[in-house]
């Protein structure tokens, strides 16, 4: 009889075991375990009748189609075999064991005791057959195995081979290289690759396979396994396979499909091709004069582009438009998209106007083209170039006038200070009672007319000031305060201030420049009681043009000592005394002034201690502070107080030979002007240089103009 066993392990014994087995007996045990397992059989006891080639009693172990072993006897001999320690292993998941005894037994034989168990098959090690083994990676588990693929590959539906996803390759460049996946390594199995070359209409694709060409083939049948097919419109070229590459293919089309198919077997290196677009050729190009064409090629075909550029200092000119470069393209009909432009020399055009300066051409015919040269200069002697630069500008390749120091910026012409167009007289001889000033001797002298209409009746008064720049006048603070209150400092409104410059004879205002005020700035610490910090500025509404009669004075260096004792300085003024007149009357008539024509006096600086003592000895509260200095003569004389309030006391600077405003006419003693030992008191300007620059919004000590350096 037959026993079916399906467990994963079990025990099989001869009938009657451990007693002797009966004669004429036959039992078959069919063991079946799941797929992925095999059956291991071994015997713990074996005692059967022995016979030649186990003809009488035996145990036979077999699978569906082969006998694995036949056992009998008690010991192994030449003609019979006992299992002993031997293990019988089924190749698959089925094993059949048959026990048979013949009709007679001379002795008593106890039979056998066998055990079986299911054991895992390591398919990864055992599957040699390419058709069954994993393409890339094999993973064993109890009862089975599975396959996986390298990065970039996909497991085929057969769960064994590794294919690639290569159906979506688009090539749009005019040249390129296409290869089988993983080239030059063997290409993947079970893959369907599609490569599309899609170029612009007008191109024709040429294909060229390279030396290595290795696609699985068959000796008789053309390309049954793996192949390449090339589809051009409705036409299909191929299939191609084997080891000989196809000849170059001129597709005559701008659109090509390359199909590559591989089956589930084989190890072949694949293929590589290069493609390039061919198009209609365009005529040869000649670069323009003073220009070049890039890239420079022997031939140009459809879609080739060239860039036309010009030599340094030249610009591409196309349709009257200047540009740096111009691009043209070879069209599909074999013509160029545009004509070659010309190269035109760069023109910097007329140079910009320089305020207070002029420009001269260094190049003949006043040329303004590339490498032409111009020179800016300032209107000397009234203006000088800032930083003393050369003023030479060259027409650059960019079409801009360029200076080595300033680049494209124009130079700055700053007012020259302290250098009258007429030389001031020597400072040796004393001038008694003042002397007429020649026009242009004191070009910084300003007449300040204040008409305070905020009071009824209107208040009107006059003072002097000194021009510091085209827009700023330096004067005394007391000139620019509302006069009707001696206890408070209320600046006059800017609308009430008029400044006259270039005025010489008050009867003749034709040559004078008059300007209204944009700002009135009194020193914040001006003290009305003792006239300490008696300094102020007026910003003019419009900058004044400089000339022989209108030029600024220089500011001194910042030095607390001020001018040295006994140094001679000059003060100019009209000595205006009668205010009960209109502005026009004062400007046009000399009858109400001490002098119609500007007067000047020469005065020595008085030692500070002497001046202080002179005022302290007087009745009244007079204070000569460190912000003041005195000038005049011990014995007095009219000239000591000729100048108008706010006027400049100027001294010639030895180093720079420029006139410097060291003082501003501020105040004097109560006695009649010119009395003995009544010195004029002046604001010490050198204490205020920083403040002045700060108000004018300029850097300290900029030169020329401004501060003596």
């Amino acid at each position: 009889h037959t026993v079916e066993l399906n467990d994963m392990f079990g025990q099989i014994q001869s009938p009657g075991y451990p007693d002797s087995y009966p004669s004429d007996s036959e039992v078959t045990w069919n063991i079946t375990v799941p797929d992925g397992f095999r059956i291991k059989l071994y015997f713990m006891h074996f005692n059967l009748e022995s016979s030649y080639l186990c003809e009488y009693d035996y145990v036979k172990v077999e699978t569906e189609d082969q006998v694995l072993a036949t056992f009998c006897g008690r010991e192994t001999t030449d003609t019979e075999q006992t299992p002993g320690q031997e293990v019988v292993l089924s190749p698959g998941s089925f094993m059949s064991i048959t026990f048979r005894s013949d009709f007679s037994n001379e002795e008593r034989f106890t039979g056998f005791d066998a055990h079986y168990m299911a054991v895992d098959v390591d398919e990864c090690k055992e599957r040699e057959d390419e058709e069954l083994s994993c393409d890339h990676y094999c993973h064993n588990y109890i009862g089975g195995y599975y396959c996986s693929c390298r990065f970039g590959y996909i497991l085929h539906t057969d769960n064994r081979t590794c294919r690639v996803e290569c159906s979506d390759n688009l090539f749009t460049q005019r040249t390129g290289v296409i290869t089988s996946p993983d080239f030059p390594n063997p290409y993947p199995k079970s893959s369907e690759c599609l490569y599309t070359i899609e170029l612009e209409e007008g191109f024709m694709v040429n294909l060229q396979f390279e030396d290595i060409f290795d696609i699985e083939d068959h000796p008789e049948v053309p390309c049954p396994y793996d192949y390449i097919k090339i589809k051009v419109g409705p036409k299909v070229l191929g299939p191609f396979c084997g080891e000989k590459a196809p000849e170059p293919i001129n597709t005559q089309s701008h659109s090509v499909l390359i199909l590559f198919h591989s089956d589930n077997s084989g190890e072949n290196r694949g293929w590589r091709l290069s493609y390039r677009a061919a198009g209609n050729e365009c005529p040869e190009l000649q670069p323009p004069v003073h220009g070049k064409i890039e890239p420079s090629q022997a031939k140009y075909s459809f879609k080739d582009q060239v860039l036309i550029s010009c030599d340094t200092g030249y610009k591409v000119l196309k349709d009257n438009v200047e540009m740096d470069t111009f691009q043209i393209e070879c069209l599909k009909d074999g013509t160029w998209s545009n004509k070659i432009p010309t190269c035109k020399i760069v023109d910097c055009r007329a140079p910009g106007e320089l305020e207070h300066g002029l420009v001269t051409f260094s190049t003949r015919n006043n040329l303004t083209t590339y490498k032409s040269e111009i020179r800016y200069s300032c209107q000397e002697p009234y203006y000088k170039m800032l930083n003393n630069i050369t003023g030479i500008y060259t027409c650059s390749a960019q079409g801009v006038w360029m200076n080595k120091v300033l680049g494209r910026s124009l130079p700055t012409c700053l007012p020259e200070c302290g250098q009258p167009s007429r030389s001031l007289p020597s400072l040796v001889k004393r001038i008694i009672g003042g002397r007429n000033a020649e026009p242009g001797l004191f070009p910084w002298q300003a007449l300040i007319v204040v008409e305070d209409t905020s009071r009824v009746p209107n208040d009107k008064w006059f003072g002097s000031g000194a021009l510091l720049s085209e827009s700023w006048i330096l004067t005394a603070a007391h000139v620019l305060r509302s006069q009707r209150r001696d206890t408070t400092v209320i600046p006059v409104s800017k609308e009430h201030v008029t400044v006259y410059l270039g005025l010489h004879d008050v009867r003749d205002k034709s040559g004078a420049v008059n300007s209204s005020a944009a700002r009135v700035v009194l020193h914040p610490d001006f003290n009305i009681q003792n006239y300490n910090h008696d300094i102020a500025l007026v910003q003019l509404q419009e900058p004044v043009p400089l000339g022989p009669h209108v030029m600024p004075v220089c500011l001194p260096r910042l030095e607390p000592e001020g001018p040295s004792p006994h140094m001679l300085g000059l003060v100019a003024g009209w000595g205006i005394s009668n205010p009960n007149v209109t502005v026009d009357e004062i400007i046009s008539s000399g009858t109400r002034t001490l002098s119609d024509v500007l007067q000047y006096v020469k005065l020595p600086v008085v030692p500070h201690a002497e001046c202080k003592t002179s005022y302290e000895s007087r009745s009244g509260n007079y204070s000569v502070t460190e912000n003041m200095f005195c000038a005049g003569y011990y014995e007095g004389g009219k000239d000591t107080c000729l100048g108008d309030s706010g006027g400049a006391f100027v001294i010639l600077d030895d180093l720079s030979q420029r006139w410097v405003v060291q003082g501003l006419v501020s105040w004097g003693g109560p006695e009649e002007c010119g009395s003995k030992q009544v010195y004029g008191v002046y604001t010490k300007v050198s204490n205020y240089v920083d403040w002045v620059w700060e108000q004018m919004g300029s850097p300290q000590g900029r030169a020329p103009g401004g501060t003596v350096s």
Partner: antibody, heavy 113, light 112 residues
Framework: EVQLQQSGAELVKPGASVKISCKAS????????IEWVKQRPGHGLEWIGE????????DYNERFKDKATFTADTSSNTAYMQLTSLTPDDSATYYC??????WGSGTTLTVSS | DVVMTQTPSSLAVSAGEKVTMSCKSS????????????LAWYQQKPGQSPKLLIY???TRESGVPDRFTGSGSGTDFTLTISSVQAEDLAIYYC????????FGGGTKLEIK
């Protein structure tokens, strides 16, 4: 015609405040100082201070710094003087004056409980 | 403060007579910049506001009869009425505006 029109007489209690107005016409109000003057019988005239309406600049007599405050409304051409912490000593006629030449009609203030 | 002293404090004159009244200041009222003397004379008739007669010590305000004359300089000033009229009955005040303005105590003019 140039005129300064002052507000009417005021009767207030001690400790209170009062604001006297002065409306100008016939000239450019913003460009001229307005002064305020106090007159008490037997005490003559006393200058309180002034304001320039266009800029708002003010100048006070030290004696009235904590008593009077000047303001100006250029849209209505009116100057104001506010007097605070009133006492019977503040009873007087107050004049506004256009920078010395033209006087208002005066406002009589009586401080009494 | 600048003290202004007016004399006499009152006077009585007949119509047509000449009258002078004085005003002294405790310091000079001459401004050295404007060269002006900041002294004014005012007339206050009974029940009226003061009215400007003279400014800058000697300049007559427009519309003021020429019988009124201001004079003086520095610290001593005078108002003269050359021929007194009945309508000149008033208190006359001097005022300085050289510094913080101050008024004189007034001179009361009565007509006999």
């Amino acid at each position: 015609e140039v005129q300064l029109q002052q507000s009417g007489a005021e009767l207030v209690k001690p400790g209170a405040s009062v604001k006297i107005s002065c409306k100008a016409s016939g000239y450019t109000f913003t460009g001229k100082w307005i002064e305020w003057v106090k007159q008490r019988p037997g005490h003559g005239l006393e200058w309180i201070g002034e304001i320039l309406p266009g800029s708002g600049s003010t100048d006070y007599n030290e004696r009235f710094k904590d008593k009077a405050t000047f303001t100006a409304d250029t849209s209505s051409n009116t100057a104001y003087m506010q007097l605070t912490s009133l006492t019977p000593d503040d009873s007087a006629t107050y004049y506004c004056v256009r920078s010395e030449d033209l006087w208002g009609s005066g406002t009589t203030l009586t401080v009494s409980s | 403060d600048v003290v202004m002293t007016q004399t006499p404090s009152s006077l009585a004159v007949s119509a047509g007579e000449k009258v002078t009244m004085s005003c002294k200041s405790s310091q000079s009222l001459l401004n050295s910049v404007t060269r002006k003397t900041y002294l004014a004379w005012y007339q206050q008739k009974p029940g009226q506001s003061p009215k400007l007669l003279i400014y800058w010590a000697s300049t007559r305000e427009s519309g003021v009869p020429d019988r009124f004359t201001g004079s003086g300089s520095g610290t001593d000033f005078t108002l003269t009425i050359s021929s007194v009229q009945a309508e000149d009955l008033a208190i006359y005040y001097c005022k300085q505006s050289y510094t913080l303005p101050t008024f004189g105590g007034g001179t009361k003019l009565e007509i006999k």
